[in-house]
């Protein structure tokens, strides 16, 4: 049994880190493999993660961690029974992938404006809470070429767009993702999308 692509890990900088890797051939990840992880400091407790399959040769493991902090560094050992397949280390604060924003809502009752709001995925006690910026993707359900990205670089998780910039009588969808500039993170996954119907009509004089 051989590792084809070594584990790469990302952290949500809260309590979960996710590691993915590829094996040399089809593998029942949960039955055959274990990923052991241990905080690098004194004789910290060793934890075990049972991986799941992620495609035929891919494995993924969700490592539960007790409140990730900037000082933490973990050793990772990938075992197949008694055989050590790979050994590495992982510092969560240097490999952050933020949690996806939630509760994306579209408010169309404000005249001439479409207001999108969502929730910051972090609590205020987390440093990322005040460090996130967002990208909002809006697209026409009937015409995928009619798609746009709005960058939200201010802290408030809201976006206002003039309804007149969207086609009238069309259903649109929106989704949002986040990243943290100070940590040079990767982008989060996209939030679930939400749908609305743009019923805005231009005033008669402008037609």
């Amino acid at each position: 049994m051989k590792v084809l692509q070594e584990p790469t890990c990302v952290s949500d900088y809260m309590s979960i880190s996710t590691c993915e890797w590829k094996m040399g051939g089809p593998t029942n990840c949960s039955a055959e493999l274990r990923l052991l992880y241990q905080l690098v400091f004194q004789s910290s407790e060793t934890h075990t993660c049972v991986p799941e399959n992620n495609g035929g040769v891919g494995c993924v493991c969700h490592l539960l961690m007790d409140d990730v902090v900037s000082m933490d560094n973990y050793t990772l050992d990938l075992w197949a029974g008694q055989q050590l397949l790979w050994k590495g280390s992982f510092k969560p604060s240097e490999h952050v992938k933020p949690r996806a924003p939630g509760n994306l809502t579209v408010h169309t009752n404000v005249s001439d404006t479409v207001l999108l709001t969502w929730s910051n995925p972090y609590p205020p006690d987390n440093y990322l809470y005040n460090d996130l910026t967002y990208a909002v993707n809006i697209w026409n359900e009937n015409d995928l070429a009619d798609s746009r990205i709005h960058n939200v670089t201010y802290l408030k998780p809201t976006l206002r767009i003039p309804a007149s910039t969207l086609k009238s009588g069309i259903s649109y969808r929106a989704r949002v993702r986040a990243w943290a500039q100070h940590y040079n993170t990767t982008w989060s996954e996209w939030s679930p999308s939400t749908k609305w119907y743009n019923s805005y009509r231009e005033p008669f004089e402008q037609r």
């Epitope: 900088y13 690098v40 007790d66 900037s70 000082m71």
Partner: antibody, heavy 121, light 107 residues
Framework: QVQLQESGGGLVQPGGSLRLSCAAS????????LTWVRQAPGKGLEWVST????????LYADSVKDRFTISRDNAKNTLYLLVNSLKPEDTAVYYC??????????????WGQGTTVTVSS | DIQMTQSPSSLSASLGDRVTITCQAS??????LAWYQQKPGQAPKLLIY???RLQAGVPSRFSGSGSGTSFTLTIGGLETEDLATYYC?????????FGQGTKLEIK
């Protein structure tokens, strides 16, 4: 506002024990890692121990490991440090400290006023 | 363990002077560095975190810079109330470690 109030210090003989307490208010106690830092007379600051928010992870300086035990009671908003087998070099002011953010657990935005432990025969 | 070395260990400066204190880490700590001010008989007070981020309520004459292994605390124009000992501290890896301190006196 955040308040941290240490207590439990005193004069103790070498080999003796004390339990230091830090009563906290003004923030969601259970959300933060908390730390004890000490300062010997006329000396600099020395990290002693940290307990993570959920209490599952405790970390100690080599100089106190196996002698000191950090714990917390999230229901009482109180941090503790049980100090055993005390040595003269443990004589110091002991501060409890709270970070600005839970995951920047070493950036201490709030400190108590300190409690003095004197180890002498 | 990461060693933090401050220089100078003490310095004397006049009111209005620009004062610089440096902190050297024994290995790279990215920007995980904090600066504290401690006045006699008081608990330390956080001035700077993340290498350069000014803590709320701290006068803007204080600034921090640097990353990797070399860091600087600058006081733009020294005032009487700045008489204190200043400490740097890394929070990049366990164990947390402090510099030995720089005692600042007013000429």
């Amino acid at each position: 506002q955040v308040q941290l109030q240490e207590s439990g210090g005193g004069l103790v003989q070498p080999g003796g024990s004390l339990r230091l307490s830090c009563a906290a208010s003004g923030f969601t106690f259970s959300s933060y890692s908390l730390t004890w830092v000490r300062q010997a007379p006329g000396k600099g600051l020395e990290w002693v121990s940290t307990i993570k928010a959920r209490g599952g992870t405790t970390l100690y300086a080599d100089s106190v490991k196996d002698r000191f035990t950090i714990s917390r009671d999230n229901a009482k908003n109180t941090l503790y440090l049980l100090v055993n087998s005390l040595k003269p070099e443990d004589t110091a002011v002991y501060y409890c400290a709270k970070p600005l953010y839970n995951n920047l657990a070493g950036d201490f935005g709030s400190w108590g006023q300190g409690t003095t432990v004197t180890v002498s025969s | 363990d990461i060693q933090m070395t401050q220089s100078p260990s003490s310095l004397s400066a006049s009111l209005g002077d620009r004062v610089t204190i440096t902190c050297q880490a024994s290995q790279s700590i990215s920007s995980y560095l904090a600066w504290y001010q401690q006045k006699p008989g008081q608990a330390p007070k956080l001035l700077i975190y993340g290498g350069s981020r000014l803590q709320a309520g701290v006068p803007s004459r204080f600034s921090g810079s640097g990353s990797g292994t070399s860091f600087t605390l600058t006081i733009g124009g020294l005032e009487t109330e700045d008489l204190a000992t200043y400490y740097c501290q890394q929070d990049y890896s366990w164990p947390l470690t402090f510099g030995q301190g720089t005692k600042l006196e007013i000429k």
